[in-house]
Interface confidence: low
């Protein structure tokens, strides 16, 4: 993790690259690795795309193990094939406005994003494209047989989406933040970002937190009970240790993670919070994250479509955040 | 529309200081950067520093003990300040927007005699 | 500190092409360079015209473009007018700070 030791270089005679991801020697000058990108996290052995104008951003000296590249002020931002230029704010499609800062893009939806549960009144909610309108909107299907009875639906609620309000105003500022972006891994330790003014100085910043939708080695839907078709928040058996790049929390944390759906369904976080989690790493340093604790994940058809950036990055945005 | 002006003297003496402002409109200090550049027959044009939107400052290895950037957000002004000044500082010095250095101000020419 | 070079002079026709190129004396020019260009009218009048190495500034014609080319960064003029007639500046970022080059004189010849 750190240049002390000798050089041991993995993958000889060099890691074979994604497109667009340039082969770099690593921070201590030993081994040839694929640099990260925008949003990954690096260490002194990962350095970040130089050829993107990326550093790592360890955020305080205290972390200066694992950080988060980031582009340098003012970088521009590529989004949807346009350049967008830092501070500049555009309108992506009638759903988002969104706003280049440092090559970070944050957007803020226009339309309404909550995720409806099931409930009395509407015990199958879809949501679908109403013709010359822009928003969708939810309708509800008539169940395909009429079985739900009485007792049965106090299981059903509406879940309220909490959240900083965007256009909340403090003195002399319009106070906007934009939704924490979906958890860059579908499993494992991943990376959400938003773009806020809530602070000090009213000055437009990113932020970044460490988030785990689920954990990879977990067989969840093996769990599934017998007749349904989802797990929406998985019981975690016993409370566990976050891995960080050779670091280890300090705690032990009973998390929750979101299931799995074998009926097309996804499962993604729908209440949030960002709390801090110390790390401690081999050569005893310790440093301190922000990371994403979910508290209700939602079991939904508006699962990420991989044509469509916008509904892969904000159906499975982070709802409701407590942080 | 982006608009960046400014307003210093244009004669000072040898070993006096330079103070320059630059009060921009139409955009944000907390959103765009601001440049100082100078130009002079001899030496083309010369980037002095920068504010960064953050307030964070990178300077001219050359200028950096003598030179001085600060900013106040909120009336939307830029201070540029240089000290020690000599005959060869004589140039004209212009503030810029960051961002492909799109806007500049309309320039302050300084010419440093006794 | 690093030296950028430009050519000192270009000519051209109205509607003619011509290719500005600006050179880094320690190495290529890459993205991370932050490439830009910049136009000067008469009366000291700068307009940025490129950024980002080829981001466009607002306003700015399309006739204008910006790019790498080998180990150099570079300003395409295509179908020049004879507005375009003007001294042109790149500047290349160093990690730390902007050096500018000597500037090219475009002549639209017309």
């Known amino acids: 993790q750190n240049c002390s030791g000798p050089c041991r270089c993995p993958d000889e005679p060099a890691p074979r690259c994604p497109a667009g991801v340039s082969l770099v020697l690593d921070g201590c000058g030993c081994c040839r690795v694929c640099a990260k990108q925008l949003g990954e996290l690096c260490t002194e052995r990962d350095p970040c795309d130089p050829h993107k104008g990326l550093f790592c951003d360890f955020g305080s000296p205290a972390n200066r193990k694992i950080g988060v590249c980031t582009a340098k002020d003012g970088a521009p931002c590529i989004f949807g094939g346009t350049v967008y230029r830092s501070g500049e704010s555009f309108q992506s499609s009638c759903k988002y406005q969104c706003t280049c800062l440092d090559g970070a893009v944050g957007c803020m939806p226009l339309c309404s994003m909550d995720v409806r549960l099931p409930s009395p009144d509407c015990p199958f909610p879809r949501r679908v494209k109403l013709p010359g309108k822009c928003c969708e909107e939810w309708v509800c299907d008539e169940p395909k047989d009429q079985t739900v009875v009485g007792p049965a639906l106090a299981a059903y609620r509406l879940e309220d989406t909490f959240g900083p309000d965007p256009t909340m105003i403090r003195a002399n500022c319009l106070v906007q933040t934009t939704e924490w972006s979906a958890c860059s891994k579908t499993c494992g330790m991943g990376i959400s970002t938003r773009v806020t003014n809530d602070n000090a100085s009213c000055r437009l910043e990113k932020q970044s937190r460490l988030c785990m939708v689920r954990p990879c080695e977990a067989d969840l839907e093996e769990n599934i009970k017998k007749g349904k078709k989802c797990i929406r928040t998985p019981k975690i058996s016993k409370p566990i240790k976050f891995e960080l790049s050779g670091c280890t929390s300090m705690k032990t944390y009973r998390a929750k993670f979101c299931g799995v759906c074998t009926d097309g369904r996804c499962c993604t976080p729908h209440r949030t919070t960002t709390l801090p989690v110390e790390f401690k790493c081999p050569d005893g340093e310790v440093m301190k994250k922000n990371m994403m604790f979910i508290k209700t994940c939602a079991c939904h058809y508006n699962c990420p479509g991989d044509n469509d950036i916008f509904e892969s990055l904000y159906y499975r945005k982070m709802y409701g955040d407590m942080a | 529309q982006v608009q960046l002006k400014q307003s210093g003297p244009g004669l000072v003496q040898p070993s006096q200081s330079l103070s320059i402002t630059c009060t921009v409109s139409?955009?944000?200090?907390?959103?765009?950067?601001v440049h100082w550049i100078r130009q002079s027959p001899g030496k083309g044009l010369e980037w002095l520093g920068v504010?960064?939107?953050?307030?964070?400052?990178d300077y001219n290895a050359a200028f950096m003990s003598r030179l001085s950037i600060t900013k106040d957000n909120s009336r939307s002004h830029v201070f540029f300040k240089m000290t020690s000044l000599q005959t060869d500082d004589s140039a004209i010095y212009y503030c810029?927007?960051?961002?492909?250095?799109?806007?500049w101000g309309q320039g302050t020419t300084l010419t440093v005699s006794s | 500190q690093a030296v950028v070079t430009q050519e000192s002079a270009l000519t051209t026709s109205p509607g003619g092409t011509v290719i500005l190129t600006c050179r880094s004396s320690?190495?290529?020019?890459?993205?991370?360079?932050?490439a830009n260009w910049v136009q000067e009218k008469p009366d000291h009048l700068f307009t940025g015209l490129i950024g980002?190495?080829?981001n466009r500034a607002p306003g700015v014609p399309v006739r204008f473009s910006g790019s790498l080319i080998g180990d150099k960064a570079a300003l395409t003029i295509t179908g020049a007018q004879a507005e375009d007639d003007a001294m042109y500046f790149c500047?290349?970022?160093?990690?730390?700070?902007?050096?500018f080059g000597g500037g090219t004189k475009v002549t639209v010849l017309g």
């Open positions: 810029a927007r960051d961002g492909g250095f799109d806007y």
């Open positions: 139409g955009f944000s200090l907390t959103t765009f950067g």
């Open positions: 504010i960064w939107r953050r307030g964070g400052t």
């Open positions: 320690i190495g290529a020019v890459t993205t991370s360079n932050y």
């Open positions: 980002g190495t080829s």
């Open positions: 500047a290349l970022w160093y990690s730390t700070h902007y050096v």
